[in-house]
Interface confidence: medium
């Protein structure tokens, strides 16, 4: 097209630009080591560093690892992207009682409205179920299902949400993403099929490298790239996303190209010593007598650091389950965490990783 010549000519003799025939305009040539954020970059700000899979480019332009959603009570809400961390949220049927960056530190099951109460607002990943008194004359069965949710199959109504019992399987032997999903519920949603895109957004045919957006014609490789599980931090450095591989942690938000993965204590535990994007020390969420039950709503969505309470005190408790079973927080493995050294000495896996990760992805034996 003759009318395109003047535009093409403006690129000639200018080494910092090239002509893109597809869009019929001059484009800025990203310097070596940077990749374009759009098809035809116009200025240096349209070029960026490229990170590896599972890493994102953070505000300081460093590749930093995305968070993991490896805890049983978390699911991935948004994947690890080139400029943002993976984000995790509480799995369906649960809500976040203690938030964390890009994740949730503590998930509880939604409350079931007790007899004489109906659902005012159904629970979400962020909020617990809100109940209200049933109007006089409304039968317990309720005319409208969305206005009244009765406990199914004769379950006892709960006065407050209950945390998930931490898995008692040999999660400590799992590599990075350990533990079994609760009842393998929603397996199709929580377990990636071999050919489906993984959380790092890469095709299964190329598992180790991030999908590189092709550079415009003649522009060369021009996007900063970090290794997998790293994100680009504020200083422009590739930084590892935190890993939630400890048995008492779960992933709240995923690793993105520019933000870290975040971890939180698994259900039934509370963070006694916080750490950047994670918790350095999780302690069992104590049981309390019926008269001392506190409202979890009081702490919903709070980003709080809890100091371990003095022995014998019960700051914020789980009601004893109605069926008389002791909650998992009384298990020996968890009580081991309540230790003066717990913030320094973390649980140590004692065997080699198992052959399959919790997502069914085979783990190669390098031996």
């Amino acid at each position: 097209f003759p009318q395109d010549r003047p535009f093409e000519d403006t690129c000639h003799g200018n080494p910092s630009h090239y002509y893109d025939k597809a869009v019929r305009r001059c484009c800025y040539r990203c310097p070596m080591g940077l990749f374009p954020t759009q098809q035809c970059p116009q200025r240096p700000t349209d070029c960026r560093k490229q990170c590896e899979p599972d890493y994102y480019l953070d505000e300081a332009d460093r590749c930093t690892a995305c968070v993991t959603c490896s805890r049983d009570d978390l699911v991935e809400k948004t994947p690890c992207a080139w400029n943002s961390s993976r984000v995790c949220e509480c799995r369906p049927g649960m809500f976040c009682s203690t938030s964390a960056v890009n994740s949730c530190a503590r998930c509880f099951f939604h409350s079931v409205c007790p007899a004489g109460m109906i659902v005012k607002f159904p629970g979400t990943a962020q909020k617990n179920t809100v109940c209200e008194p049933a109007s006089p004359g409304v039968s317990p069965a309720c005319a409208s299902p969305e206005n009244c949710k009765e406990p199914s199959s004769g379950t006892i109504p709960q006065a407050k949400p209950t945390p998930v019992s931490p898995a008692t399987s040999s999660a400590s032997t799992m590599p990075v993403r350990g533990g079994t999903r609760l009842a393998q519920e929603a397996a199709s949603k929580l377990t990636r099929a071999p050919d489906s895109p993984s959380s790092v957004g890469r095709p299964s045919s190329d598992p180790g490298l991030s999908p590189t957006q092709p550079c415009p014609e003649g522009s060369g490789d021009c996007r900063k790239q970090c290794e997998p599980d790293y994100y680009l931090d504020e200083a422009g450095r590739c930084t590892a996303c935190v890993s939630c591989s400890r048995d008492d942690l779960v992933e709240k938000t995923p690793c993105a190209w520019n933000s870290s993965r975040t971890c939180e204590c698994r259900p039934g535990m509370i963070c006694a010593t916080s750490a950047t994007n994670s918790c350095a020390r999780c302690v069992p969420y104590p049981i309390c007598a019926a008269e001392t039950v506190t409202k979890p709503q009081d702490m919903a969505e709070k980003d709080t650091t809890f100091e371990a309470p003095p022995l014998g005190t019960q700051p914020d408790c789980n009601p004893t389950p109605e069926n008389g079973e002791a909650p998992a927080s009384t298990s020996p493995t968890q009580s081991l965490l309540v230790d003066s050294q717990a913030s320094k000495t973390l649980p140590i896996p004692t065997s080699a990783p198992v052959a399959l990760s919790s997502t069914g992805k085979p783990v190669l034996d390098a031996g």
Epitope: G33, F35, Q50, E52, P53, D54, R62, C63, T64, A65, T68, S70, M174, P175, V176, R177, S198, S199, V200, D206, P207, G208, L209, T212, D221, R223, Q225, C226, E227, P228, D229, Y230, D233, R237, C238, T239, A240, C241, V242, S243, S245, R246, C255, A275, T276, N277, S278, L346, P347, I348, P349, P353, S357, T359, K361, V363, L364, A366
Partner: antibody, heavy 123, light 107 residues
């Protein structure tokens, strides 16, 4: 099994250049980045940078920018590191390495290493 | 860059002893730390990743722990074949950095 086989020892003069190779086998070459690590005599390990064989993208430790150039040849499953303007300070063992493929997260710790190439710079 | 300070630089121990090597990061690196063993004339071999996970085939006498800035490699019941130099590595933020190494000698 995964193997990284590096080229033989090099004796070079100051000011010269040298190109080291790292041939990968036992896996799909374009699937993993190849990293290079330097170890001077009696010293510790220093990360130089990596090359993405699939895209040709490379990233360097600022300390080694200008000194090293990383490339890869997909047809021969080989990664290369060229060292320029050599001085006695560049005398070292150079390793190529590859991260592991454990679990679902791909952090950069190295499960596979080449045997190393010794570069001696002397007049 | 993140500096990994390893101590001690060298240590002498006897077969059957328990030794502890520490590594301190100049800033928080979460649990993104690996430990390597390098025997004389050989390439490094990974022992521990994610601060506390033993790599496949590594004897269980090697134990890693720590998070944030303080990390430890413990070798219980030291064996003659453990004569080597041990390195920690942070892979939290690029550039990747290693500790200066700890040379373990067997009496």
């Amino acid at each position: 099994q995964v193997q990284l086989v590096q080229s033989g020892a090099e004796d070079v003069r100051p000011g010269a250049s040298v190109k080291l190779s790292c041939k990968a086998s036992g896996y799909t070459f374009t699937t993993y980045t190849i990293h290079w690590v330097r170890q001077r005599p009696g010293q510790g390990l220093e990360w130089i940078g990596y090359i993405n064989p699939s895209s040709g993208y490379s990233d360097y430790n600022q300390k080694f920018k200008g000194k090293t150039t990383l490339t890869a040849d997909k047809s021969s499953n080989t990664a290369y590191m060229q060292l320029n303007s050599l001085t006695s300070e560049d005398s070292a063992v150079y390793y190529c390495a590859r991260r592991a493929d454990y679990g679902n997260y791909e952090y950069t710790w190295f499960a596979y290493w080449g045997q190393g190439t010794t570069v001696t710079v002397s007049s | 860059d993140i500096v990994m300070t390893q101590s001690p630089k060298s240590m002498s121990t006897s077969v059957g002893d328990r030794v502890t090597i520490t590594c301190k990061a100049s800033q928080n690196v979460g649990t993104n730390v690996a430990w390597y063993q390098q025997k004389p004339g050989q390439s490094p071999k990974v022992l521990i990743y994610s601060a506390s996970y033993r790599y496949s085939g590594v004897p269980d006498r090697f134990t890693g722990s720590g998070s944030g800035t303080d990390f430890t490699l413990t070798i219980s019941n030291v064996q003659p074949e453990d004569l080597a130099t041990y390195y920690c590595q942070q892979y939290h933020t690029y550039p990747l950095t290693f500790g200066g190494g700890t040379k373990l000698e067997i009496k």
